[in-house]
Interface confidence: low
């Protein structure tokens, strides 16, 4: 039997479900009395799903898992993992008996996109061209571990005097804070682009300061 | 909690065979695998292969390769390992292991009593 | 095959020492290491898993570090329970292998 998963990541949503794709070819008159089939995680060895004896077994890991019943005899043991967390995050390996056996591993990878960057300033009033100002760009509830970058209202990338910080929560989402500290000129425009590196999602926001008032 | 029940010592003649069993109790027998161990006297530990039952299959050390067969009966929940062509260097004491609910296929949580193999003519 | 190298093979000691025994694997093996303990006429009993995993029930005593290639037990404090036999062994790939073993005994 030759087992065969998708070499590409597959790539889920937090809090949404996830199929990590397995399939084999059964020779004719396969019946799944035949079929031994275990879900297991890579790296520690840990059960996830197995199917075995002309039945599922059931899920081995947190009761989110499922196999698709249906679609098992066409050779298709791909699993459903429902409301995919952080945690799950990791390589799956997808083990199939019927006479002989094969194997072959695929990566989950969690993702979470980022909120729109709210922005602060420090001082936020009686600004004069040659203050030296703080922006603080924050964004929220993102997976993985987020890309940013400053620019100045030409675009042109500010990476001096750049402090990021970026801290998990309980469910092991980030929060941002990257912080910007620049002397005014007369006018001035700062964008913070927070960038996703697995969905490829940007979050803008900037600041233009004018004197007074400020744009958000 | 699982145990591990192995069948009772043996005395064998050089060439000949035994079959070791291993009753499993208490866990899902069908779902982890069951492993082999031996101990010669005096001596250190020496893995000899593995069956998951789940799948049917065993894996050996190379060593024992073409000399060593190792079983499952699921619906006894009984793991069997026989070895042939015996020699004095096979008399040992014979473990079968397991990672019980861990769901470890290679680590050893539960181990049988041990069976004492002796070969001698 | 992996080839596990304990050290010492023999360590004298006294109740209350501090003890650290070494495992050398020929490969890396990442942390894929377990260790046993083993008493006269006993079967062995698992006592850290992925090389620092104190496992369930045994003593806060017992503790494993290292990766790679370079493993060490430590037993903070020696207990009269402690002298035994201590086995290290690789999970990183078939076939499973251990160590040679090492025996603890009273100085």
């Known amino acids: 039997v030759e087992v065969q998963v998708s070499e590409d990541p597959v790539v889920a949503l937090v809090d949404t479900d996830a199929t990590l794709r397995c399939s084999f070819s059964p020779e004719p008159g396969f019946s799944l009395a035949q079929l031994n089939l275990i879900w297991q995680l890579t790296d520690t060895k840990q059960l996830v799903h197995s199917f075995t004896e002309g039945r599922d077994q059931g899920s081995a890991y947190s009761n989110r898992t499922a196999l698709f019943p249906d679609l098992l005899v066409q050779g298709n043991a791909s699993l459903r993992l429902q409301r995919v967390r952080v945690t799950d995050e990791g390589s799956y390996t997808c083990f199939v008996s019927i006479q002989d056996f094969d194997s072959a591993a695929v990566s989950l990878q969690v993702a979470a996109p980022y909120s729109k960057p709210s922005m602060t300033l420090e001082p936020n009033k009686d600004l004069r061209p040659g203050n030296m100002v703080t922006i603080t760009c924050s964004s929220y509830q993102g997976y993985p571990e987020a890309e940013v970058f400053w620019k100045d209202g030409q675009g042109v990338p500010l990476t001096g005097n750049v402090t990021t910080s970026q801290m998990a929560n309980e469910r092991g989402l980030f929060d941002v804070h990257s912080v910007l500290r620049v002397v005014l000129g007369a006018n001035g425009t700062y964008s913070c682009l927070v960038r996703n590196p697995v969905l490829q999602q940007d979050a803008h926001g900037s600041v233009t300061i004018t004197g007074q008032p400020l744009t958000f | 909690q699982v145990q591990l029940v192995e069948s009772g010592a043996e005395v064998k003649k050089p060439g000949s065979s035994v079959k070791v069993s291993c009753k499993a109790s208490g866990g899902t027998f069908s779902s982890y695998a069951i492993s082999w161990v031996r101990q010669a006297p005096g001596q250190g530990l020496e893995w000899m292969g593995r069956?998951?039952?789940?799948?049917?299959?065993?894996n050996y050390a190379q060593k024992f390769q073409g000399r060593v067969t190792i079983t499952a009966d699921k619906s006894t929940s009984t793991a069997y390992m026989e070895l042939s062509s015996l020699r004095s260097e096979d008399t040992a004491v014979y473990y079968c292991?397991?990672?019980?609910?861990?769901?470890?296929?290679?680590?050893?949580?539960?181990w049988g009593q041990g069976t004492l193999i002796t070969v001698s003519s | 095959d992996i080839q596990m190298t304990q050290s010492p093979s023999t360590l004298s000691a006294s109740v209350g020492d501090r003890v650290t025994i070494t495992c050398r694997a020929s490969q890396s093996i990442d942390n894929w290491l377990a260790w046993y303990q083993q008493k006269p006429g006993k079967a062995p009993k698992l006592l850290i898993y992925k090389a620092s995993s104190l496992q369930s029930g045994v003593p806060s005593r017992f503790s494993g570090s290292g990766s790679g290639t370079e493993f060490t037990l430590t037993i903070s404090s020696l207990q009269p329970d402690d002298f035994a036999s201590y086995y290290c062994q690789q999970y990183d790939s078939n076939p499973l292998t251990f160590g040679g073993g090492t025996k603890v005994e009273i100085k």
């Open positions: 292991a397991n990672g019980g609910d861990s769901s470890s296929w290679y680590t050893f949580d539960y």
């Open positions: 069956i998951i039952p789940i799948l049917g299959i065993a």
